[in-house]
């Protein structure tokens, strides 16, 4: 389904008859169809999007979303304000930075518009949720005859990410990986000349700031070996594709959160 | 392969009531609303109401309320509708149709079973 | 309850003629919700186009669907033997699930 972004006074209800949902065991009373689950991810504390499968209601329904954080300054209910669609029916809510607290409580309320009593509630940590960008920048040194280091940057989280290197030359089979902790820089000791060498890079939001799951995309691949420049054959480096947005289309020269702020967050 | 079986013809009294099968296979039974549709000989298709097979829970068309009920059995992935009440205006092919896992259409079908109501 | 009418009731053409089937709703119905059926005797329905436009799996090309609001049309480019059947539409926006009377194409 092909998800586009409006906001509410784009969103065409589509109304439909009030009918009678029942569960088979007992056909007098009316019993309701659960909502489908709402997932969140953050997006490198730029953006938040909270998705649910609009297809699994029984009708195409403009679902509701509200959203608020528990115990905290932020706790007045919010409705959303930039809806996602699928369909041309509600499918999502994307949050801007402004309205990101990592280290609260966040609560979503999904609810029918047509049926109040029908609605569901979720509390999620988003520390937990938070998906950062693809690494980029990726850079080779050659620090001795047979040593390489890889170098690459993460935009804005750097400190908070662990990351995973997987490497292989063209006559491995599969990938040999190795986790790598904040530091954003993996050597490889002993490098076969004859060989063409493949390198790729993802990260996540864990464990300095948060406990997430996901992992980025990976990185673009960077190569080196017998294939590459031969004009300096100690430096190659390959800038990763920018497929995400710029930090100047969100509109924001200030970062997101310092690195103090993260710390003070994560042990506070 | 992913299809529909359902039950063989039935011929009913009118005041009888009938109950029809539809066996899914090939595909997660539970993940997909069941619809049931009906078309009388020579006539147009007409819808009946839905079962939801993860919960259980139904939603009848107003005109067949109070004489339809739709279950299912998800250890034997099938779907039942059963009408009460037969009237001769009931005779037709009940269909059983599986609405799409990504929209609201219905995207396969069953071969139908006929009901034939006689006195 | 959204009301769809078919037109014409029958169409009487030869191989290889186009085919133009009407639909035509009570009320506006998003073009994401319209879906044609083709039935032959004695088979069920198979779904051919939905969202008003989209073929379903296996549909040949010939088939395609236009149409929003309230003016839906299905258009068969060139007949095949094989295409001689009863056409419904059916709006999926809104319960309760409506189809159209049918049309008929039917060889000349």
């Known amino acids: 389904l092909n998800t586009t972004i409006l906001t509410p006074n784009g969103n065409e209800d589509t109304t439909a008859d009030f009918f009678l949902t029942t569960m088979p065991t007992d056909s007098l009373s009316v019993s309701t169809l659960p909502l489908p689950e709402v997932q969140c991810f953050v997006f490198n504390v730029e953006y938040m999007n909270c998705t649910w499968n609009s297809s699994s209601e029984p009708q195409p329904t403009n679902l509701t979303l509200h959203y608020w954080y528990k115990n905290s300054d932020n706790d007045k209910v919010q409705k959303c304000s930039h809806y996602l669609f699928s369909e041309e029916i509600t499918s999502g809510c994307q949050l801007q930075k402004k309205e990101i607290h990592l280290y609260q409580t966040f609560v979503v309320q999904l609810q029918d518009p047509r049926e109040p009593r029908r609605q569901a509630t979720q509390m999620l940590k988003l520390q937990n949720l938070v998906i950062p960008w693809a690494p980029e920048n990726l850079t080779l040194h050659k620090l001795s005859e047979s040593q390489l280091e890889l170098n690459w940057n993460n935009r804005f989280l750097n400190h908070c990410l662990e990351h995973l290197v997987q490497y292989r030359t063209d006559w491995d089979h599969s990938w040999t990986e190795q986790s790598v902790d904040y530091r954003h820089k993996f050597s490889l000791p002993s490098v076969d000349g004859q060989k063409r060498y493949t390198f790729r890079v993802r990260s996540r939001f864990n464990p300095l700031c948060g406990s997430a799951q996901h992992w980025s995309e990976w990185s673009h691949p960077i190569h080196w070996g017998s294939n590459t420049s031969k004009e300096n054959p100690f430096l190659f480096a390959l800038e990763a594709e920018q497929k995400l947005i710029s930090e100047e289309d969100l509109g924001g020269e200030q970062k997101l959160i310092s690195e103090e702020d993260l710390h003070h967050h994560h042990h506070h | 392969q992913v299809q529909l079986v359902q039950s063989g013809a039935e011929v009913k009294k009118p005041g009888a009531s009938v109950k029809v099968s539809c066996k899914a296979s090939g595909y997660t039974f539970t993940g997909h609303y069941m619809h049931w549709v009906r078309q009388a000989p020579g006539q147009g298709l007409e819808w009946m109401g839905w079962i939801y097979p993860h919960s259980g829970h139904t939603n009848y068309a107003k005109r067949f309320q109070g004489r339809v009920t739709m279950t299912r059995d998800t250890s034997i992935t099938t779907a039942y509708m059963e009408l009460i009440r037969l009237r001769s205006d009931d005779t037709a092919v009940y269909y059983c149709a599986r609405r799409s896992g990504r929209s609201w259409y219905f995207d396969l079908w069953g071969r139908g079973t006929l009901v034939t109501v006689s006195s | 309850e959204i009301v769809l009418t078919q037109s014409p009731g029958t169409l009487s053409l030869s191989p290889g003629e186009r085919a133009t089937l009407s639909c035509r709703a009570s009320?506006?119905?998003?073009?994401?919700?319209l879906a044609w059926y083709q039935q032959k005797p004695g088979q069920a329905p198979r779904l051919l186009i939905y969202g008003a436009s989209s073929r379903a799996t296996g549909i040949p090309d010939r088939f395609s669907g236009s149409g929003s609001g309230t003016d839906f049309t299905l258009t068969i480019s060139r007949l095949e033997p094989e295409d001689f059947a009863v056409y419904y539409c059916?709006?999926?926006?809104?319960?309760?699930?409506?189809f159209g009377q049918g049309t008929k194409v039917e060889i000349k």
């Open positions: 009320q506006s119905v998003s073009s994401s919700y």
């Open positions: 059916q709006q999926y926006g809104s319960s309760p699930w409506t």
